[in-house]
């Protein structure tokens, strides 16, 4: 699987999950989140050659098409597969509120 | 929705489904399929700017990150959303066999 265990410990050039830290205030303009100040969101990057973690029948066909037509702009793209939630703390008035934000952290990628 | 109805009738530059015809023999090297000779597979293409048909919480965050950090390589990617099957006919010996190939045709796209 193209997950953090594999991708973070290798120098994989093809589609893989990459490290990305997002600072809520600086990168998103969100000043109201108290904790955490930011988080390891990660992102997916890298080419999707034929047979590389292809998602559907269609992406297999498209990767093969791309192999036969190297100049074509039609090619599978490296996108998130497994996403995880992130708990945050913010204040509603003086009272802290804990909220679980779904689908915020990329754990693995796929070619789609 | 970024579907064939909208995308094929517009000059949309952002993520949208585009027309692509795949010839089984020429583009994939598959000589064994009897009918059809090829099909309109389509593909997804175009940038994924802030708020453009974003798939998950994560893709919204990433698009916003990208807006604040225009030079970053982390950005959502335009990929298939709705896929449709394709019926094919091939021969097993002298006997024709009809098979439904799932997830072969792109009907709409999303930013993931």
């Amino acid at each position: 699987a193209l997950d953090t265990n594999y991708c973070f410990s290798s120098t994989e050039k093809n589609c893989c999950v990459r490290q990305l830290y997002i600072d809520f205030r600086k990168d998103l303009g969100w000043k109201w989140i108290h904790e955490p100040k930011g988080y390891h969101a990660n992102f997916c990057l890298g080419p999707c050659p034929y047979i590389w973690s292809l998602d559907t029948q269609y992406s297999k066909v498209l990767a093969l098409y791309n192999q036969h037509n190297p100049g074509a702009s039609a090619a599978p793209c490296c996108v998130p597969q497994a996403l995880e939630p992130l708990p945050i703390v913010y204040y509603v008035g003086r009272k802290p509120k804990v909220e679980q934000l779904s689908n915020m952290i990329v754990r693995s990628c796929k070619c789609s | 929705a970024l579907d064939t109805n909208y995308c094929f009738s517009s000059t949309e530059k952002n993520c949208c489904v585009r027309q692509l015809y795949i010839d089984f023999r020429k583009d994939l090297g598959w000589k064994w399929i009897h009918e059809p000779k090829g099909y309109h597979a389509n593909f997804c293409l175009g940038p994924c700017p802030y708020i453009w048909s974003l798939d998950t919480q994560y893709s919204k965050v990433l698009a916003l990150y990208n807006q604040h950090n225009p030079g970053a390589s982390a950005a959502p990617c335009c990929v298939p959303q709705a896929l449709e099957p394709l019926p094919i006919v091939y021969y097993v010996g002298r006997k024709p066999k009809v098979e439904q190939l799932s997830n072969m045709i792109v009907r709409s796209c999303k930013c993931s």
Partner: antibody, heavy 121, light 111 residues
Framework: QVQLVQSGAEVKKPGASVKVSCKAS????????MNWVRQAPGQGLEWMGQ????????NYNEMFEGRVTMTTDTSTSTAYMELRSLRSDDTAVYYC??????????????WGQGTLVTVSS | DIQMTQSPSSLSASVGDRVTITCRAS??????????MHWYQQKPGKAPKLLIY???NLESGVPSRFSGSGSGTDFTLTISSLQPEDFATYYC?????????FGGGTKVEIK
């Protein structure tokens, strides 16, 4: 420049629902909380609740809990407020207003023009 | 809920007068060195307009004749020299506790 443009006036019967829209422009819609405030004829201001468009997080005034739903469509930068089981005392001008961004509950620096909702049989 | 009591509920004044409006909260609205108190102006048929945020900060574009002060439970909005366009209703608002609440308003009329 920042603008919040609300939908037009509505007349509803008691027991019905109303959905008011607020289209934002001139700023990053997903970076600020959107509040809804109402004002009955000749009365003061009453905060109904708020939503953070990027995440869909909401905080509602308990007084409206169960009757109000706030949603957004980030693709069109539009916020919506739906109020159900309308009563005659829900007759008011409904405003959307952007929070200034330091906290969830905050001062509100930009306001829509208001939408008059009249509840009458 | 925090109750916000404004006084007076209405007042008559002349152009050039110094006008003071007070707002008292039912409990302190201070937190970490900030006073979570704001002031708005509203003219008939119009939406409220933010004047002062966090007790004493003047909103961008608001004339300097408007000022705010106070802490804890007692706050004041002052108009140093009343102008014709200042005749309106003024509201205080707290955001220290959920739900966010407003004062009942002070109507400033022409004498």
């Amino acid at each position: 420049q920042v603008q919040l443009v609300q939908s037009g006036a509505e007349v509803k019967k008691p027991g019905a629902s109303v959905k008011v829209s607020c289209k934002a422009s001139g700023y990053t819609f997903t970076s600020y909380w959107m509040n809804w405030v109402r004002q009955a004829p000749g009365q003061g201001l009453e905060w109904m609740g708020q939503i953070f468009p990027a995440l869909g997080s909401t905080n509602y005034n308990e007084m409206f809990e169960g009757r109000v739903t706030m949603t957004t469509d980030t693709s069109t930068s539009t916020a919506y407020m739906e109020l159900r089981s309308l009563r005659s005392d829900d007759t008011a001008v409904y405003y959307c207003a952007r929070g200034i961004g330091n906290y969830a509950l905050d001062a509100m620096d930009y306001w829509g023009q208001g939408t008059l909702v009249t509840v009458s049989s | 809920d925090i109750q916000m009591t404004q006084s007076p509920s209405s007042l008559s004044a002349s152009v050039g007068d110094r006008v003071t409006i007070t707002c008292r909260a039912s409990e302190s609205v201070d937190w970490y060195g900030n006073s979570f108190m704001h002031w708005y102006q509203q003219k008939p048929g119009k939406a409220p307009k933010l004047l002062i945020y966090y007790a004493s900060n003047l909103e961008s574009g608001v004339p300097s004749r408007f000022s705010g002060s106070g802490s804890g439970t007692d706050f004041t909005l002052t108009i140093s020299s009343l102008q014709p366009e200042d005749f309106a209703t003024y509201y205080c608002q707290q955001n220290a506790e959920d739900p966010l609440t407003f004062g009942g308003g002070t109507k400033v009329e022409i004498k």
